[in-house]
């Protein structure tokens, strides 16, 4: 079955810094979403080879892409405290396939020592059952951190 390898599992970065999230699959995709999870899931990007990527207005001007839809690295720049959260890759094939999630912890520079990532990935046991056409769960609540403020979801 198709899988999405997502890395890193967790990263701690100071305000204003950048983070790379990589979504890798064995190919055969129509495209890939990066979604910020929470009670109100938030699409960050939709990337499809040969098509202009769709980017949420909150991240416009601070997202870069490298690679192809099968092995995509998404770079989020100038991170803000409100960008803290769990981000998951959703690969669109004949079914939906989900990555394990990346917990991004954006911290005030002076409090770097307070919040650190453990080596463990986001806990899959906390995730709800997947939709019927999904190969892996869509983790709506993988982060134990409070959700950032909701942002506009216009493409």
């Amino acid at each position: 079955a198709q899988e999405v390898q997502q890395s890193p599992h967790c990263t701690t970065v100071p305000v204003g810094a950048s983070v790379n999230i990589t979504c890798s699959t064995s190919g055969g995709l129509r495209g890939i979403y990066l979604r910020q999870l929470g009670p109100q899931p938030q699409d960050i990007i939709y990337y499809e080879d040969g098509v202009v990527p769709t980017t949420d207005r909150r991240f416009r001007g601070r997202i870069d892409f490298s690679g192809s839809q099968d092995n995509l690295t998404i770079t989020m720049h100038r991170l803000q405290l409100s960008d803290t959260g769990t981000y998951t890759c959703q690969a669109i094939t004949e079914v939906n396939v989900y990555g394990s999630g990346t917990l991004v912890l954006v911290t005030e520079e002076q409090s770097q020592g307070w919040h650190r990532c453990s080596d463990a990935p986001p806990r899959a046991s906390a995730l709800p059952a997947p939709p019927t056409g999904s190969a892996l769960p869509d983790p709506q609540t993988a982060s134990a951190l409070p959700d950032p403020p909701a942002a506009s979801a216009l493409p």
């Epitope: 899931p41 699409d43 939709y46 949420d56 004949e94 997947p130 979801a153």
Partner: antibody
Framework: EVQLVESGGGLVKPGGSLKLSCAAS????????MSWVRQTPEKRLEWVAS???????YYPDSVKGRFTISRDNARNILYLQMSSLRSEDTAMYYC???????????WGAGTTVTVSS | DIQMTQTTSSLSASLGDRVTISCSAS??????LNWYQQKPDGTVKLLIY???SLHSGVPSRFSGSGSGTDYSLTISNLEPEDIATYYC?????????FGGGTKLEIK
Amino acid sequence: EVQLVESGGGLVKPGGSLKLSCAASGLTFSSYAMSWVRQTPEKRLEWVASISSGGFTYYPDSVKGRFTISRDNARNILYLQMSSLRSEDTAMYYCARDEVRGYLDVWGAGTTVTVSS
Amino acid sequence: DIQMTQTTSSLSASLGDRVTISCSASQGISNYLNWYQQKPDGTVKLLIYYTSSLHSGVPSRFSGSGSGTDYSLTISNLEPEDIATYYCQQYSKLPYTFGGGTKLEIK
């Protein structure tokens, strides 16, 4: 059992507006993309709009700038705001669960929109 | 846009017959093709997704096949409740597009 129930259709004059609703039950609404599809009086099916579970929206050129799809995950309701309506928008409007970006696995019974002076 | 063509707009067959409905795309759609059934009362149901995968609850007498630009839906043993209009739909690229439908009637 997944159920989708459309409402809000009716008779409207050209240039007018109408807002359709689709109430969903029996599913984790926030986990799914949703779509609107219409059927013309000639029985042709036309895709009208889609919204991903994370809120990205998609439209064909024929309705772009006139129709807006939105969702209320707290209330499990899908909306279609239609403005600057034209006679060619006359159709039965169906909402559908969009299982995998275009694979519409559950459909409602539809609501009729008639645009006529 | 990808154009979907169902060349047969209506088809008449006898109960127990094997019926095949065809659909062609104006360009390759990589098997991203669905088949829907619309009953006379307007109810729409998904039958087949991704060319040949049977949707849950759909009788096994329905099957789909094809590749590239040419696809087909087969009903192996026609039953009275199969009287309906059948539509193909591509979901390879936006905008999603449907065929014009094939209305199936009983002889």
